[in-house]
Amino acid sequence: EEELQVIQPDKSVLVAAGETATLRCTATSLIPVGPIQWFRGAGPGRELIYNQKEGHFPRVTTVSDLTKRNNMDFSIRIGNITPADAGTYYCVKFRKGSPDDVEFKSGAGTELSVRAKPSAPVVSGPAARATPQHTVSFTCESHGFSPRDITLKWFKNGNELSDFQTNVDPVGESVSYSIHSTAKVVLTREDVHSQVICEVAHVTLQGDPLRGTANLSETIRVPPTLEVTQQPVRAENQVNVTCQVRKFYPQRLQLTWLENGNVSRTETASTVTENKDGTYNWMSWLLVNVSAHRDDVKLTCQVEHDGQPAVSKSHDLKVS
């Protein structure tokens, strides 16, 4: 009778992460008697994947019933495949021995390759807000994909950006890869409603590319413009002075009125109006009793916006 051969018909198998891999193996004879074992890798450092005789292998199931006397099919299924499972798997026949079984013959091996989708891209912006005309950096990260080939694009409001740098790690062979990209974006006063989008395309994606977004509303600070105006004199020598605070973002704003350098009133912006571009306007007024002053009065509207140093605008009130 011809000597037993271990046949692994598939040189290579490609599996999607999360799926089940079937590794086929048949023997050409029932003799010699002894168990089959599956290993990943060859040589002394090989990893035991399945032992017909003993052990607990929760992810592995056999295709056939190995307890049947005439069984020669030693194929296995490995469930919930991850990129870490990639490698060459060997089906090895052992001859029954005492005290230990002796390795008799190995199959040629089946190389298992794994394709894995990239994780949803995560976009993060700068820790501190920046003002228009400044350049800020955004980062985009996606992990766990295989194979290594991947494309990443940046968009601002649908317009593709060109000022970015991308790295895919590691540079050499690996079971899975990560991508990291940094894009530079110049802020404008109209960017409160703007979005920065990182788009990742990979062979495993059946839909459109994966997208990660960042809202520039979390990054931008638009400082207010101030205008102080005097309204016509009212009865009983009262003058109404208004401070128009325009085009600011975010809403966090505190306004202080000063009369000749002395604090008259402090208030926090509450009932603001929103502009189409997402910035806010607010108006504060001060009623000044002219008869209480002998000399001209310097009125100052002082605004502290979003924790920044105060900006102010003054108005000289003539007392005739």
């Epitope: 999607a16 394709r115 994606l205 839909g207």
Partner: antibody, heavy 116, light 109 residues
Framework: VQLVESGGRLVQPGTPLTLSCTVS????????MGWFRQAPGKGLEYIGI?????SPYYASWVNGRFTISKTSTTMDLKMNSLRSEDTATYFC?????????????WGPGTLVTVSS | DIQMTQSPSSLSASVGDRVTITCRAS??????LAWYQQKPGKAPKLLIY???FLYSGVPSRFSGSGSGTDFTLTISSLQPEDFATYYC???????????FGQGTKVEIK
Amino acid sequence: VQLVESGGRLVQPGTPLTLSCTVSGFSLSSYVMGWFRQAPGKGLEYIGIISSSGSPYYASWVNGRFTISKTSTTMDLKMNSLRSEDTATYFCARVGPLGVDYFNIWGPGTLVTVSS
Amino acid sequence: DIQMTQSPSSLSASVGDRVTITCRASQSINSYLAWYQQKPGKAPKLLIYSASFLYSGVPSRFSGSGSGTDFTLTISSLQPEDFATYYCQSWHYISRSYTFGQGTKVEIK
């Protein structure tokens, strides 16, 4: 799992025509689908794909002449102003479950003849 | 666009022969290459994907190899049902577009 193309016929130059690809055994919302064509005695030519979410992508030569769309069970190829060089068998195909780099299921094709 | 050059355009062979068809890409496509078999009046059938993986149900006499720009389809022992036209098809991961080779017709000698 099956794909069947329909709508192919003899048309005059300048005429529009819409081909359909009806699928069974799987969901169009899970796979990228493609359209291809093959002129008589010639090789295979890629026309375009539609992603699982419904976004179409076209070969550079298409130049807006063709439009790919889909419903829950059919994918359509709308062809404007047909020319004699558009005479071909048109195939629809589905990409493999492991990635969009190959097509593992094809329809039998439908013949479009453009002639006056 | 990427160009795929297949050779030979046709070949004559006998049953039992070893047949090799090559496909060259105008730029690297890594391993994103598929091989199809097509018979007259029929749709293409997938044989090999990702350059070297045998599609389920395809006889093991078919094998694929290569990466980058040069690829090979080998039929180890030609059978009567293998007389057909064979196409390579690339996918470019940056342009996300597909290109076919012009085909190789395998005829009976």
